[in-house]
Interface confidence: low
């Protein structure tokens, strides 16, 4: 991260896989060193420390201090360290949820994957990529949101009832686009504006439902930064 640069924010959905991107610009003369590159990912949680003591005796490089008496908030700790020979070390309970793509690493992509991401994973992440005597770094802030779809009125509906479906993700900015769809067999059928379906931002209004409307309804929220989330809701209409 160069001085003056903003720390990028990466959004992820709780319970879904999350990618923490890190593809630093590798000088051409160092490309041959990628096979032997080491990477250390550090995490400073946003709030209360996850269980287990920070640091790991096997992790190469410095270990952060335990959060006991120093600092009013959790300390940074090593999430995962991969040495030149592929030797891994890290800290439970994140493993084995934490993964690096080995093939990606040889292409200069040191992204960290959380499979799945949990609320406690929110916070600042820093990666140090070590190439011989050179260290490149990535820095980002992971924010986690919850996705939900609610129906108003809730519960089972009768034929000719109306319903409003609201698709939401706990993120402060509005989605750039909202797409509604229905699952039919193996495919998705887009829901378009019609006398039966009224679309307004993240809301879908069905003025008169019928038993044919029973089944899964879905929406995809896409944000300006490219993050998207898919949410499903099972509608029940009684004949």
């Amino acid at each position: 991260l160069q001085p003056g640069a903003e720390v990028p924010v990466v959004w992820a959905q709780e319970g879904a896989p999350a990618q923490l991107p890190c593809s630093p610009t590798i000088p051409l003369q160092d490309l041959s060193l990628l096979r032997r590159a080491g990477v250390t990912w550090q995490h400073q949680p946003d709030s209360g420390p996850p269980a287990a003591a920070p640091g790991h005796p096997l992790a190469p490089g410095p270990h952060p201090a335990a959060p006991s008496s120093w600092g009013p908030r959790p300390r940074r700790y090593t999430v995962l360290s991969v040495g030149p020979g592929g030797l891994r070390s890290g800290r439970l309970p994140l493993q084995p949820r934490v993964q690096l793509d080995e093939r990606g690493r040889q292409r200069g992509d040191f992204s960290l994957w959380l499979r799945p991401a949990r609320r406690a994973d929110a916070g600042e992440y820093r990666a140090a990529v070590h190439l011989r005597d050179r260290a490149l770094s990535c820095r980002l802030r992971l924010r986690l949101g919850q996705a939900s779809m609610t129906a108003s009125p809730p519960g089972s509906l009768r034929a000719s009832d109306w319903v409003i479906l609201n698709c939401s993700f706990s993120r402060p900015d509005r989605p750039a686009s909202v797409h509604w769809f229905r699952n039919r067999g193996q495919g998705r059928v887009p829901v378009r504006e019609s006398p039966h379906h009224h679309l307004a931002e993240s809301f879908l209004f069905l003025p008169q439902v019928s038993p044919m409307d029973s089944g899964p309804w879905g929406c995809i929220l896409t944000y300006r930064d490219g993050f998207n989330v898919s949410i499903m809701y099972n509608l029940t209409v009684l004949g």
Epitope: L1, Q2, P3, G4, A5, E6, V7, T40, Q42, P60, G61, P62, H63, P64, A65, W70, G71, P72, R73, R75, R76, E124, R126, A127, A128, D133, A135, S137, R139, R141
Partner: antibody
Framework: QVQLVQSGAEVKKPGASVKVSCKAS????????MNWVRQAPGQGFEWMGI????????TYAEEFKGRVTMTRDTSTSTVYMELSSLRSEDTAVYFC??????????????WGQGTLVTVSS | DIQMTQSPSSLSTSVGDRVTITCKAS??????VAWYQQKPGKSPKLLIY???YRYTGVPSRFSGSGSGTDFTFTISSVQPEDFATYYC?????????FGQGTKLEIK
């Protein structure tokens, strides 16, 4: 670019207090905590404490507890360090220092220009 | 607190010479040692962190090594602008502590 600009030199009498400011620019102020480190004339460095700029919560080194207060003003991206009950041995250059580009805490890649505080009767 | 003992306290050298400064920690600090350069009336500049990693923009003549308790800082070929005081610092845990400094002087 990333910059920390400190307030000017101060001359104080023993027993008085001094408040030094450190204004950050070139980055998002709340993304990096701020440390205060002092250097007595011809001496090495002594870490005084850290303030987490997002929450405003400080942590002080044992030797300064009860005498130092660190605060921040996010509206002006400024951190303050106040040292009370000054004595002659507090004569030093006081630096604010951030770990802006660090991978770990506790080393400092961005420093203010320093503020000389002289305590003399 | 972890004590950092730096030696020598001063060193006279000439342009082009190779210079080595050592730092000893009072306990194991893994590879968590940084090195700074300070010129009179100026703030310190970070040169090396994590014992051996050069900070952005630092010339390759500056290098560091070591782990555990013994650390070395080397300038492979001293340049005129390198005459300054150098400090080691452990960043293993809080409170961060510094060595007393090594003043590099022109012979």
């Amino acid at each position: 670019q990333v910059q920390l600009v400190q307030s000017g030199a101060e001359v104080k009498k023993p027993g008085a207090s001094v408040k030094v400011s450190c204004k950050a620019s070139g980055y998002t102020f709340t993304e990096s905590p701020m440390n205060w480190v002092r250097q007595a004339p011809g001496q090495g460095f002594e870490w005084m404490g850290i303030i987490y700029t997002d929450t405003g919560e400080p942590t002080y080194a044992e030797e300064f507890k009860g005498r130092v207060t660190m605060t921040r003003d996010t509206s002006t991206s400024t951190v303050y360090m106040e040292l009370s009950s000054l004595r002659s041995e507090d004569t030093a250059v006081y630096f604010c220092a951030s770990d802006y580009g660090s991978i770990l805490y506790w080393y400092f890649d961005v420093w203010g220009q320093g503020t000389l505080v002289t305590v003399s009767s | 607190d972890i004590q950092m003992t730096q030696s020598p306290s001063s060193l006279s050298t000439s342009v082009g010479d190779r210079v080595t400064i050592t730092c000893k920690a009072s306990q194991d600090v893994s590879t968590a040692v940084a090195w700074y350069q300070q010129k009179p009336g100026k703030s310190p500049k970070l040169l090396i962190y994590s014992a051996s990693y050069r900070y952005t923009g630092v010339p390759s003549r500056f290098s560091g090594s070591g782990s555990g308790t013994d650390f070395t800082f080397t300038i492979s070929s001293v340049q005129p602008e390198d005459f300054a005081t150098y400090y080691c610092q452990q960043h293993y845990n809080a409170p961060p502590t510094f060595g007393q400094g090594t003043k590099l002087e022109i012979k």
